[in-house]
């Protein structure tokens, strides 16, 4: 029959061409002399001559070497004519199919990749993705299936297991609890995309994971003890700058601290506000403090931070005591 | 023995036609390309084009489609090329050579002995 | 268009020297080459075809090598009958074009 099944022909073949595919035949050969020939892209249209076909034989012939990802498959036309060059049967569909061959290594979309993810977060938070193209076929074979590893982590605190990516998507995730800001701020991860599913060419990109701060840490008092020393009558007079340290990232609402006097200012005598770069505690007197009423306040003031704690925390206290100074007032008649 | 015949010199005038032949024997004419090659005097060698006489089929260099008109006699075994609207340009000696199909990529392995064109006035 | 280059343009050699011609395409043709002889006043005859299979009669002296852009003809030992031009041809999909040969002349 007039009739051709779909011819595959490995990509990359090594010759020698012309390479004999497959023979035309009509069997209108009987009756009269016939001679074959092929149109079509790969023919006799760009890409030309990838195809031809031995006239009088019908022997169709691949001329070079294919390249799948180029071009995957062909569609070529079959014609036979008798001698004195009238078409003896329709032209007939021949379809070319370029197998695959593992000839393309995969390839990161990027050299580096970035992320991020809280401190402290449970095991199996998503932290990024990392993706790998093949070129090959990842369809019909696994040539062009891209499997996902991590080769190595930096720094390996609080050990190298930190972090794992899915075999298949790359989506990378915490796998294990201890992530801290304070003492890893960022890990390396050298990250591998193989393709074979695994078993073939590999490739390595850096996926680096940014520790954003949790407010794990409370500030703190460093003293938790002032002595201080106000003239009485003073309104707005600044009495004691309070210090605290706070281990979460500077500048941030989980290190940025709020004060508040718990106990000692039963008259309302006192306010505290907190310096926008120091971060102290700035105790000033809201009203004049009378010596001959009381010469000695003490109070009791308790920091927190201007965001919430991501975990129960002591809350860090400290003490000033006010010393109210004498001064010589005008008698009152 | 294979063998390519060639006819003999022409002198043509400017602005007419000629017709030179190629007559082959000892092969299967039908089944060979037949290819058509320029030689200008004291110059390199310009495929013209081919034919197949089995079925007729031509293919030509861009350069010569509408100078040069490749056919071919099978009862005969003898191919022709017509040139058309000569002029100096197309002084030259045409040669003829085979090539076989099988392999479909084969190269000239027997030529004619040429063909001198001269145009002039 | 394919373009084929061929270098030396002419080339003067001795009875018994070795030379070599090279070609070169301006796309890959894979081992789709041919070298011819011509002879002054005579027609080209094959020597080398398929890169470098010797066309039937052609002496062992004549050698063909290359692939893909970059051909070259080799003949060992030359003889006074070994003078002429010499052409590189594609045989690989129509049109055919040839180099522009080269003039091998006896020193």
């Known amino acids: 029959d007039w009739v051709v099944a779909p011819i595959s022909v490995p990509e990359n073949g090594k010759g020698p061409f012309p390479q004999r595919l497959n023979q035309l035949k009509s069997n209108k050969d009987r009756d009269t002399k016939i001679f074959y020939s092929i149109t079509g892209p790969g023919a006799d249209s760009p890409p030309e001559g990838v195809f031809a076909v031995e006239k009088e034989t019908g022997w169709l012939l691949l001329n070079k070497p294919l390249d799948r990802e180029e071009i995957a498959k062909y569609e070529l036309f079959g014609h036979a004519v008798s001698e004195n060059g009238a078409s003896v049967e329709d032209p007939m569909n021949i379809s070319i199919i370029v197998t695959d061959q593992n000839d393309h290594k995969p390839k990161f979309t990027q050299d580096t990749f970035r992320g991020s993810v809280l401190e402290g977060v449970m095991p199996g938070t998503s932290v990024m993705q990392v993706t790998a193209t093949d070129e090959d076929d990842a369809v019909n074979t696994y040539n062009g299936v891209v499997a996902y590893s991590i080769h190595s982590q930096e720094p390996k605190e609080p050990h190298d297991l930190m972090f794992t990516i899915h075999k298949s998507t790359g989506t990378i995730s915490v796998i294990s609890s201890g992530l801290d800001r304070e003492k890893v701020p960022e890990y390396r991860l050298t990250v591998q995309a193989t393709d074979m599913d695994g078993e073939g060419s590999t490739t390595t990109a850096e996926a680096v994971v940014q520790i954003l701060d949790a407010n794990d840490n409370a500030p703190e008092f460093d003293p938790q003890k002032y002595e201080a020393h106000v003239p009485e009558n003073a309104v707005g007079h600044e009495v004691q700058r309070l210090t605290v340290t706070d281990l979460d990232a500077p500048n941030s609402p989980a290190w940025r601290a709020t004060y508040l006097i718990m106990g000692g200012d039963d008259g309302d005598h006192f306010t505290i506000t907190t310096h926008p770069e120091s971060n102290q505690g700035i105790l000033t007197t809201r009203k004049g403090l009378d010596f001959e009423a009381k010469n000695q306040h003490t109070l009791y003031v308790e920091v927190t931070n201007e965001a919430p704690f991501v975990l129960k925390l002591p809350t860090s206290t400290a003490t000033i005591v006010v010393h109210v100074e004498d001064v010589n007032e005008a008698p009152v008649f | 023995v294979q063998l390519v015949e060639q006819s003999g010199a022409e002198l043509v005038k400017p602005g007419a036609s000629v017709k030179i032949s190629c007559k082959a024997s000892g092969y299967a004419f039908s089944t060979s390309w037949m290819n058509w090659v320029k030689q200008r005097p004291g110059k390199g060698l310009e495929w013209i084009g081919r034919i197949y006489p089995g079925d007729g089929e031509t293919k030509y260099n861009g350069k010569f489609k509408g100078k040069a008109t490749l056919t071919a006699d099978k009862s005969s075994s003898t191919a022709y090329m017509q040139l058309s609207s000569l002029t100096s340009e197309d002084s030259a000696v045409y040669f003829c050579?085979?090539?076989?199909?099988?392999?479909?990529?084969?190269?000239?392995?027997?030529w004619g002995q040429g063909t001198r064109v001269t145009v002039s006035s | 268009e394919l373009m084929m280059t061929q270098t030396p343009a002419s080339l003067s050699a001795s009875v018994g020297e070795t030379v070599t011609f090279t070609c070169r395409a301006s796309?890959?043709?894979?081992?789709?080459l041919a070298w011819y002889q011509q002879k002054q006043g005579k027609s080209p005859q094959l020597l080398v075809y398929n890169a470098k299979t010797l066309a039937e009669g052609v002496p062992s002296r004549f050698s063909g090598s290359g692939s893909g852009t970059q051909f070259s003809l080799k003949i060992n030992s030359l003889q006074p009958e070994d003078f002429g031009s010499y052409y590189c041809?594609?045989?690989?999909?129509?049109?055919?074009?040839f180099g522009g040969g080269t003039k091998l002349e006896i020193k």
């Open positions: 050579a085979r090539q076989r199909d099988y392999g479909a990529l084969y190269a000239l392995d027997y």
């Open positions: 041809q594609h045989h690989y999909v129509p049109p055919y074009t």
């Open positions: 796309e890959n043709i894979y081992s789709y």
